[in-house]
C-alpha cells in the first residue's frame, strides 16, 4: 500500500487498468482508503479530475471502478483527485489527494514503417559490412512496459547480399556486388514486436537498393582488328575512319581516351570524340601510294578518370590493330626535274641535240609516256622533241644576238590515260660564238686645226661588238696601211679605247679639207675577227684662243668635239 506524499492518512495501492479489457463493466480498479475510515458508512469518497464519473467512479467503500474499456494509445494515464468527507457534516476528513490511474499496455498494435518507400544507394564493390541505410519501424504500444513495442528486424528477402542488424535496422552489405552484373536489389525487411515471441505482430518494408557505379571496368575494343582505307590524295587532318571501345561502367567512369600505341611511320594520329566515345583516326602526314601503300598501327584506349584505389582494374590497356590500305590515285607523270636548263651554241645546224627531258608514270613502272612541246601562237618553232624519248633538237640555227635564252614548256602524257599530263619548263641558253667583228661604238665627228701642233689628241675612240662581252673581252686599235699615216697616229690605250693624235703640223683647209683614216679594230675572240672603220677628220680654221676654237665652213660653226646651231 502507498501513502500520499503528504502522509496524511490516505492509503492506496498502485492503480492500473489494462487497456482494451472486455470483461463485464463496471470493472474494479482498486481501493482508495483513508486510515480514518471506520468502515461504518460515515465517510463519503468523492472523485474529481480526468474521467471522473464518466469513466471512473468510486463507491462508499472507496472502491474505484472503470465504466468502459480504455485505449492506452489514446490516453495512457488519468490524473484524478480524491476527497473523503463526513457524510453528515460534509467536512473533509483528509486533505485532497491527487493520484494516477495508469492504463496498462497490451500488444494491440502492429509495428509500422512510416518513412517508406525506402531507396538507398551504395557504391558497387563496397567491402563486406558497408552500411547501406537504416530502416526504423514504430509501434504504438508502450515501449516502457513489457515487450509489446520492443522490435526485432530481420531480412525476408535480400540474402546473401545484405543483412540487417536485428536491434537497429541497419542494413549492411554481406558481399562485394558488381553493378555491371545487377544494379538494383529489392530488400524486404520485417519488424516484429514482442522481441519475436509468440503472438507478436510484424510489418515489412521494401528497400530499393541501387548500386552506384565505380570505375571497376576498363574500356575494351569492340574489334581486335580494324581495316581502314585512305586515298593518297587525302590532305593532312583527314579523318580516315573510326574505332570503338565499350566500357561496362557508366557516366564519367565510361569516358575514354584513344591514342596511338605503335606507329613507326608516324603518319597517323587518333583523337577522341568525347560525345560519341569513338576514336577518330586522323592522317598526320600525307601518304604516297608509290612510296608505301600498307600501314599497320596499334591503338590503345584508357579511361579518362581512374582513382588511384581502382588502378588495379586498369593495369593493361586494351589495344587493337588497325590495317590501313592506301588507295592509288592515278597521278600524272613526274619529270625528273621541275625545270631543266640546257645550252647550245649559236649557229649550229638544225637537228642539233639540245638535251633530254625524262618523266615516268609513278603509278605503273611499265607504262610509257609521250612528250611534246607546248607551242605558243606567236613563237617561231625553233625546237622539236622526240615524243618517245624526250630528246630536244633545234629546227634551225640559233642566233644568240637575236635571243640569248629560250623558254619552252614540255609536256609528258600517260599513254594509258591521256588525261594525265604534266609540264616542265626548259630554259635553253644560246652560247655565244664570235661571229661579229668589232665596230666604232658611235659615229665620230673629228676636227683638226690648221694650226695644230704635232702630238695633239684630236679624238678618243672606243669599239663595240654584238657578241657576248666577257670580262676579258679585248679590242685592239691600229691604223690600217694607208697613205694618211704620216699625218696621224693611233695610240691603243690597252683598255678597249684608243687616242687619235696629230703626227705633224701645217694642215691647210685649202689643200685638204678632209682626211679619211682607216682604223683597224681586232677582237680577241676565237677565232679573232677584225674590221676596218673609217674616221673622217675635218680640217678647221681655228681661233688662236685655246678655249674658243672655231671651225668655219660654209654655214656651219664647228667647235672641237661639240656642235652648235
Amino acid at each position: 500500500d502507498y501513502k500520499d506524499d503528504d502522509d496524511k492518512g490516505w492509503v492506496w495501492e498502485p492503480l492500473f487498468v489494462t487497456e482494451e479489457e472486455t470483461s463485464t463493466m463496471p470493472m474494479y480498479v482498486g481501493q482508495l482508503k483513508s486510515d480514518l475510515d471506520k468502515e461504518d458508512g460515515s465517510l463519503q469518497y468523492i472523485l474529481t479530475g480526468e474521467g471522473a464519473d464518466s469513466i471512473f467512479f468510486i463507491n462508499e467503500h472507496g472502491k474505484i471502478y472503470v465504466r468502459q474499456k480504455l485505449d492506452r494509445e489514446k490516453k495512457s494515464f488519468y490524473i484524478l483527485r480524491a476527497q473523503v468527507i463526513n457524510r453528515k457534516t460534509r467536512h473533509p476528513i483528509e486533505p485532497d489527494s491527487e493520484f494516477i490511474i495508469k492504463v496498462r499496455d497490451i500488444n494491440d498494435h502492429e509495428p509500422q514503417f512510416l518513412d517508406g518507400p525506402y531507396v538507398a544507394t551504395v557504391p558497387e564493390m563496397s567491402p563486406e559490412g558497408t552500411s547501406v541505410t537504416q530502416v526504423t519501424a514504430t509501434d504504438g504500444d508502450d515501449p516502457s512496459y513489457g515487450n509489446n513495442a520492443r522490435l526485432l528486424y530481420s531480412l525476408i528477402q535480400g540474402q546473401p547480399y545484405f543483412s540487417v542488424e536485428p536491434k537497429t535496422g541497419v542494413i549492411r552489405m554481406t558481399s562485394q556486388m558488381d553493378r555491371e552484373t545487377k544494379d538494383q536489389y529489392l530488400v524486404v525487411i520485417q519488424a516484429k514486436d514482442m522481441v519475436g515471441q509468440a503472438g507478436a505482430f510484424s510489418a515489412t518494408a521494401t528497400v530499393t537498393i541501387n548500386l552506384s557505379d565505380v570505375n571497376d571496368n576498363k574500356p575494351i575494343f569492340k574489334e581486335s582488328l580494324y581495316r581502314l582505307t585512305v586515298s593518297e590524295s587525302a590532305p593532312t587532318g583527314t579523318s580516315i575512319g573510326t574505332i570503338m571501345a565499350y566500357d561496362n561502367d557508366i557516366g564519367e567512369n565510361a569516358e575514354m581516351d584513344y591514342s596511338i600505341e605503335e606507329d613507326d611511320s608516324q603518319t597517323f594520329d587518333i583523337i577522341t570524340n568525347h560525345e560519341t566515345q569513338e576514336g577518330i583516326v586522323i592522317l598526320k602526314k600525307k601518304v604516297d601510294f608509290e612510296h608505301q601503300n600498307h600501314y599497320g598501327i596499334r591503338a590503345k584506349v584508357k579511361n579518362h578518370h581512374v582513382p588511384e584505389q581502382l588502378m588495379k582494374y586498369h593495369t593493361e590497356a586494351s589495344t587493337t590493330f588497325i590495317k590501313i590500305q592506301v588507295e592509288d590515285v592515278d597521278e600524272p607523270p613526274v619529270f625528273t626535274l621541275e625545270s631543266y636548263v640546257m645550252e647550245i651554241a649559236e649557229g649550229v645546224v638544225s637537228g642539233s641535240l639540245v638535251g633530254t627531258v625524262s618523266a615516268r608514270d609513278l603509278d605503273n613502272d611499265d607504262s610509257s609516256v609521250r612528250y611534246s612541246i607546248v607551242q605558243g601562237l606567236h613563237l617561231k618553232r625553233l625546237f622539236s622533241i622526240n615524243e618517245h624519248n624526250g630528246t630536244i633538237i633545234t629546227t634551225e640555227p640559233l642566233d644568240r644576238e637575236k635571243a640569248s635564252w629560250h623558254n619552252i614548256t614540255v609536256t609528258a602524257t600517260e599513254t594509258r590515260n591521256p588525261e594525265k599530263i604534266s609540264e616542265a619548263n626548259v630554259y635553253i641558253q644560246v652560247l655565244d660564238v664570235n661571229d661579229h667583228a668589232p665596230e666604232f661604238s658611235k659615229y665620230y665627228e673629228t676636227f683638226v686645226c690648221e694650226n695644230a701642233v704635232p702630238g695633239q689628241l684630236i679624238q678618243n675612240i672606243s669599239a663595240v661588238d654584238k657578241d657576248d662581252s666577257a670580262e676579258n673581252h679585248r679590242f685592239y686599235f691600229s691604223l690600217a696601211q694607208a697613205t694618211n699615216s704620216s699625218h696621224f697616229t693611233v695610240k691603243d690605250n690597252q683598255d678597249n679605247t684608243a687616242g687619235i693624235f696629230t703626227a705633224g703640223s701645217g694642215f691647210s683647209r685649202k689643200e685638204q679639207f678632209y682626211f679619211f683614216l682607216p682604223i683597224l679594230i681586232l677582237d680577241n675572240g676565237s677565232p679573232p675577227l677584225t674590221s676596218t672603220n673609217t674616221l673622217t677628220v675635218t680640217v678647221c680654221d681655228c681661233d688662236t684662243e685655246v678655249n674658243t676654237l672655231y671651225c668655219r665652213y660654209g654655214a656651219f660653226l664647228y667647235s672641237i668635239g661639240l656642235s652648235t646651231e
Epitope: 581486335s224 581495316r227 608505301q292 601503300n293 600498307h294 590493330f321 590495317k323
Partner: antibody, heavy 120, light 107 residues
C-alpha cells in the same frame, strides 16, 4: 584454327584462263580486318604475291600482273577465287592462297598449294 | 617496287651452330613491315617472325629477328636438324615482295 585449301585444274593451255578457288574453314572469310591473298612460286624459284581481296569485294593486285588478274569472293561459300588470263608457260607455278595476320600484313595462314602447269 | 636481296644464297653450317641470314631492301622500310618465313620442300611457307622481331605462334625462341631501315637479320641461335631448309624475307609496306631466299644446308 583457320585452314585454307586450294582447288582447280592442274593443267591449263596457253592463252587460256587459269581459275583457282580457295576454301576457308575454321573461320569466316567475312572476319573484320583480314585480307585473302594469292601467292605463287615458280618451280625452284622465289615467291611472288599476285593480289588480295577483302570480304567486301575490294581487291588489290600486283602491278606487274594487274592487267591479267581478277580475284573475287563468295562469302556465302566462304571461298575466294583467282582468275589469270592469257597464260603462258611462264605462269607455271605452285599457287598458294593465304590470309594475313592479326598484327600486320604478313601471311599468317597458308594453303598447302596447288601446282598449275601451262602447256599445250 | 621494293627489291629485297638475301645473302648469302646458301649458308653451310653444322647443327648447334648459329645462323645469321641477311635481308637488304632497295630502299628504307619501316621495321614494322618485314617478315621472315621458313619453307621446307613440298610445303607451304611458314611464318616465323614479323614486325621484324615478333615470333609467330609456336615458333621456338631460337629464332629471332632484328634490323631497321634497309638491313634486316634473321638469327637461329642453335641450329636443329629440322632448321636446314630455305628462308625468305618479305616486306609488306609498299605492296608485297619477297626476297629470293637463303638456303641453310648441313656442312
Amino acid at each position: 584454327q583457320v585452314q585454307l585449301q586450294e582447288s582447280g585444274p592442274g593443267l591449263v593451255k596457253p592463252s587460256q584462263t587459269l581459275s583457282l578457288t580457295c576454301t576457308v574453314s575454321g573461320g569466316s572469310i567475312s572476319s573484320s580486318g583480314y585480307y585473302w591473298s594469292w601467292i605463287r612460286q615458280h618451280p625452284g624459284k622465289g615467291l611472288e604475291w599476285i593480289g588480295y581481296i577483302y570480304y567486301t569485294g575490294s581487291a588489290y593486285y600486283n602491278p606487274s600482273l594487274k592487267s591479267r588478274v581478277t580475284i573475287s569472293v563468295d562469302t556465302s561459300k566462304n571461298q575466294f577465287s583467282l582468275k589469270l588470263s592469257s597464260v603462258t608457260a611462264a605462269d607455271t607455278a605452285v599457287y598458294y592462297c593465304a590470309r594475313d595476320g592479326s598484327s600486320g600484313w604478313y601471311f599468317q595462314y597458308w594453303g598447302q598449294g596447288t601446282l598449275v602447269t601451262v602447256s599445250s | 617496287e621494293i627489291v629485297l636481296t638475301q645473302s648469302p644464297g646458301t649458308l653451310s653450317l653444322s647443327p648447334g651452330e648459329r645462323a645469321t641470314l641477311s635481308c637488304r631492301a632497295s630502299r628504307n622500310i619501316s621495321s614494322s613491315y618485314l617478315a621472315w618465313y621458313q619453307q621446307k620442300p613440298g610445303q607451304a611457307p611458314r611464318l616465323l617472325i614479323y614486325g621484324p622481331s615478333s615470333r609467330a605462334t609456336g615458333i621456338p625462341d631460337r629464332f629471332s629477328g632484328s634490323g631497321s631501315g634497309t638491313d634486316f637479320t634473321l638469327t637461329i641461335s642453335r641450329l636443329e636438324p629440322e632448321d636446314f631448309t630455305v628462308y625468305y624475307c618479305q616486306q609488306y609496306g609498299s605492296s608485297f615482295t619477297f626476297g629470293p631466299g637463303t638456303k641453310v644446308d648441313i656442312k
